[in-house]
């Protein structure tokens, strides 16, 4: 079998709401993946599991099941949404995200995604991790790749 390539493209949109009294931020983050099937047979994207971390704390998880079938030598773009909550120990972020004196309220989030594909009864998992900027101060739609956070030192290979 040839490879199945998973490419995390980036954040597509982030929709924000607040709980004023509980100083809580709700961020619905939609991400985009490109999944390429380099085989001469179809593969099924069985599930996508994703989680989002802020400051080493998991703030959101999502799982999508029975997503799609990708035909031979084909590529599909898949969007998935992770609902996240920034609260309690991190409620100090509420002040930053709602500060009206600044225009962009970017926070750095780590996006983790695992794609499980199956073909002929065989299962394969591919994982990706990316740091992304997300504006927690307003609803934002991003050009693909626009939210990439490049200034984080990646561990040496």
């Amino acid at each position: 079998p040839r490879s199945i390539d998973v490419k995390y493209i980036g954040v597509k949109s982030a929709y924000v709401s607040y709980d004023v009294q509980k100083r809580t931020i709700y961020l619905n983050i939609t991400n985009t993946l490109n999944i390429t099937n380099n085989n001469y047979y179809s593969v099924e994207v069985e599930n996508i599991t994703a989680q989002v971390q802020f400051s080493k704390t998991v703030i959101g998880k999502a799982r999508l099941n029975n997503i799609t079938i990708i035909g031979p030598l084909d590529m599909k773009q898949i969007d998935y949404t992770v609902p996240t909550v920034i609260a309690e120990e991190m409620s100090y972020m509420y002040d930053f995200c709602t500060l009206i004196s600044i225009k962009v309220h970017n926070i750095v989030l780590m996006m983790q995604v695992t794609v499980t594909t199956t073909y002929f009864g065989h299962s394969e998992q591919i994982s990706q991790e990316r740091y992304q900027y997300v504006d927690c101060g307003r609803n934002t739609t991003y050009q693909l790749g626009q939210s990439e956070y490049l200034n984080v030192l990646q561990p040496q290979q």
Epitope: S17, Y18, D19, V20, Q21, K22, E88, E89, I100
Partner: antibody
Framework: QVQLQQSGAELAKPGASVKLSCKAS????????MHWVKQRPGQGLEWIGY????????KNNQKFKDKATLTADKSSSTAYMQLSSLTYEDSAVYYC??????????????WGTGTTVTVSS | DIVMTQAAPSVPVTPGESVSISCRSS???????????SYWFLQRPGQSPQLLIY???NLASGVPDRFSGSGSGTAFTLRISRVEAEDVGVYYC?????????FGGGTKLEIK
């Protein structure tokens, strides 16, 4: 119906500790934060802090930071407040209060029966 | 901390008449979302407090519509029309916007 039943009156000596309980019934305990409020005899109300029964996270009024420890037991749907190093100023009625409502629209909709704490030597 | 001030420690009223109880906050409780986070509670003699009004003007469940709340960002009024004997007790305003939550000192409603 929704009820908060608090433990009975406490008589304690200065320097001692007491643990007050607030048993919730008639609703899903972990879905609502539980607050504690102090009322000294003939005086007004003072917010002590809250516990989130779902996560165990607590937030205290700075004034009660070293005085009150808030906890919750999910299995028994009971919130607790421990008062330590008691002084005469701690003599008061203590109420638990549920914070009901929904996002950005919360309020103390149900109050406990109150527990009287008397500090006396 | 936000200070809630109830200037009148007590207000005398004749049954059947109307009465207004006022409260001021040291900081505006009007949030940019349009909500004003002031609240009113009644504590009858020997009882626990009960919620009357939330978000300045919303009547809590089970509370008679003789009670109403109004105000601005820093000045709040609880109005009781056609006062009844069961309305006696201490009325507290509260701010539910910023920690620590704070209450007014209370206003005692007394029947003449």
């Amino acid at each position: 119906q929704v009820q908060l039943q608090q433990s009975g009156a406490e008589l304690a000596k200065p320097g001692a500790s007491v643990k007050l309980s607030c048993k919730a019934s008639g609703y899903t305990f972990i879905s609502y934060w539980m607050h504690w409020v102090k009322q000294r005899p003939g005086q007004g109300l003072e917010w002590i802090g809250y516990v989130n029964p779902s996560s165990g996270y607590t937030k205290n009024n700075q004034k009660f930071k070293d005085k009150a420890t808030l906890t919750a037991d999910k299995s028994s749907s009971t919130a607790y407040m421990q008062l330590s190093s008691l002084t005469y100023e701690d003599s008061a009625v203590y109420y638990c209060a549920r914070e009901g409502g929904s996002i950005s629209d919360w309020y103390f909709d149900v109050w406990g029966t109150g527990t009287t704490v008397t500090v006396s030597s | 901390d936000i200070v809630m001030t109830q200037a009148a420690p007590s207000v005398p009223v004749t049954p059947g008449e109307s009465v207004s109880i006022s409260c001021r906050s040291s900081k505006s409780l009007l949030h940019s979302n349009g909500n004003t986070y002031s609240y009113w509670f009644l504590q009858r003699p020997g009882q626990s407090p009960q919620l009357l009004i939330y978000r300045m003007s919303n009547l809590a469940s089970g509370v008679p519509d003789r009670f109403s709340g109004s105000g601005s960002g820093t000045a709040f009024t609880l109005r009781i029309s056609r006062v009844e004997a069961e309305d006696v007790g201490v009325y507290y305003c509260m701010q539910h916007l910023e920690y620590p939550y704070t209450f007014g000192g209370g206003t005692k409603l007394e029947i003449k």
